[in-house]
């Protein structure tokens, strides 16, 4: 079988949801000594980056300027060490936001509830979309989807203090083109009678996986890279 290098990791820097006309940055983390990285969009070559010097860094950043609906979709990357190519990375879905319209988000029975109450979010947008998405701030990968012609319901069931936080919704024109975000709705969930307001609010840290962890080599990494290179030669 044809030999390949391990697959790289593809990530979006800061977020995979990019407002139209803004710049998206995708990172492809491969290996020290990779001389070329290729970014593929919907299966076709989209961009090429060559790190300088290749042995000093374990990945590259691809900048996608002026984001629009034609650049939204599935991205993957591969890299090359010498003549040897890696496997393809997993697919990354890049979404363009701030398309067309702004939905409205409401919550029933209201934004202040007690732990155990049933809560439903409603996202309304009367144009060109049938899929709606609900996101909690700081949890952008945990997207809830719901369907409706003009309005979608997001039943949360009996809530706990873990549901506290700020929510926004989007209408989706297709899987990769979303509306402007709604104004945020802050859900406040008070605990049981005996521990009311003792539970801390969820911290809204940015999504930890939405960062590019590209590193420059140290002496130890250089030794490992050299060892890896020697091993590759032996394999050849």
């Amino acid at each position: 079988p044809k030999q390949t290098l391990p697959k790289p990791i593809i990530r979006a820097e800061s977020t995979y949801m990019v407002p139209k006309e803004k710049q998206a940055t995708l990172c492809c983390q491969g290996s020290y000594g990779a001389v070329e990285y290729q970014l593929h969009f919907e299966g076709s070559l989209f961009a090429v980056e060559r790190p300088k010097p290749p042995e000093r860094i374990n990945g590259v950043k691809f900048h996608i300027p002026d984001m629009n609906s034609r650049k939204a979709g599935r991205y993957s990357c591969i890299y090359r060490v010498g003549e040897l190519w890696s496997e393809r990375s997993d697919l990354l879905d890049l979404v363009v936001t701030e398309m067309y319209d702004t939905p409205t988000l409401s919550v029933h029975p209201g934004p202040e509830v007690t732990s155990g109450e049933k809560v439903t979010f409603y996202c309304r947008l009367d144009t060109a979309t049938s899929m709606f998405l609900l996101l909690k701030e700081g949890r952008s990968r945990d997207v809830q989807r719901s369907y409706g012609k003009v309005q979608a319901e997001f039943p949360m069931g009996p809530v706990t203090t873990a549901h506290r936080g700020s929510y926004r919704c989007f209408g989706s024109y297709n899987n990769y083109a979303w509306s402007f975000p709604s104004e945020p709705v802050k859900l406040l969930v008070t605990g049981d009678i005996e521990n009311t307001s003792l539970a801390p609010t969820d911290p809204t840290f940015p999504d930890s996986w939405d960062t590019c962890l590209l590193t420059r080599e140290t002496g130890l990494q250089k030794d490992l890279a050299l060892w890896d290179h020697t091993a590759q030669n032996l394999l050849r």
């Epitope: 139209k20 629009n68 701030e98 319209d101 144009t127 060109a128 024109y173 509306s179």
Partner: antibody, heavy 120, light 107 residues
Framework: QVQLVQSGAEVKKPGSSVKVSCKAS????????INWGRQAPGQGLEWIGE????????YYNEKFKAKATITADKSTSTAYMELSSLRSEDTAVYFC?????????????WGQGTTVTVSS | DIQMTQSPSSLSASVGDRVTITCRAS??????LNWYQQKPGKAPKLLIY???RLHSGVPSRFSGSGSGTDFTFTISSLQPEDIATYFC?????????FGGGTKVEIK
């Protein structure tokens, strides 16, 4: 920079049709809604309808549903509005406008206007 | 359809004056209210969107306020180049509708 350039003035006979064009440049045509409106002499503005060029989805003012047909050609970044069964009261300046980047239903760039005169 | 009633229909003021125009919606439109300026023979230009947000490149002497059904547009210090007709437009519900316009002239 963003520009919407409309076709030239038209003089038409009652009962005939006219097709007005609006060529967009300076932005991604499919990513913004194009609106059409009109302004009769000495009158205010009336909204006729709009198109989402990416999907071709239309919304019309009920008043103009039988009068106007709005289309878009993605390959040339051009929106069109055809007006049928013209009458003298259709004499007006017709505008195209891009619904703005804010997502808040405001029209941030406008064409220069096309005067349509209906006269026998 | 939502009716937009603008007043006054015309006004005359001196350079440097504060000018105020009001717009009333026939039903609640939240903050989805926009203001445009139109000079004779020209297309309208967006000045203010979502009640009070200034469109890029628009001088800060223009401002807007209000909510629900009652809205106000203000020019803090009228300049000669502000001679135009001003329209409000609701963006809450289709069909989008405009006020009848206010013609601003210099005394």
């Amino acid at each position: 920079q963003v520009q919407l350039v409309q076709s030239g003035a038209e003089v038409k006979k009652p009962g005939s049709s006219v097709k007005v064009s609006c060529k967009a440049s300076g932005y991604t045509f499919t990513d913004y809604v194009i609106n059409w409106g009109r302004q009769a002499p000495g009158q205010g503005l009336e909204w006729i309808g709009e198109i989402y060029p990416g999907s071709g989805t239309n919304y019309y003012n009920e008043k103009f549903k039988a009068k106007a047909t709005i289309t878009a050609d993605k390959s040339t970044s051009t929106a069109y509005m055809e007006l049928s069964s013209l009458r003298s009261e259709d004499t007006a300046v017709y505008f195209c406008a891009r619904r703005g980047r804010y997502g808040l239903y405001a029209m941030d760039y406008w064409g220069q206007g096309t005067t349509v005169t209906v006269s026998s | 359809d939502i009716q937009m009633t603008q007043s006054p229909s015309s006004l005359s003021a001196s350079v440097g004056d504060r000018v105020t125009i009001t717009c009333r919606a026939s039903q609640d439109i939240s903050n989805y209210l926009n203001w445009y300026q139109q000079k004779p023979g020209k297309a309208p230009k967006l000045l203010i969107y979502y009640t009070s947000r200034l469109h890029s490149g628009v001088p800060s002497r223009f401002s807007g306020s209000g909510s629900g059904t009652d809205f106000t547009f203000t020019i803090s210090s009228l300049q000669p180049e502000d001679i135009a007709t001003y329209f409000c437009q609701q963006g809450n519900t289709r069909p989008w509708t405009f006020g009848g316009g206010t013609k601003v002239e210099i005394k």
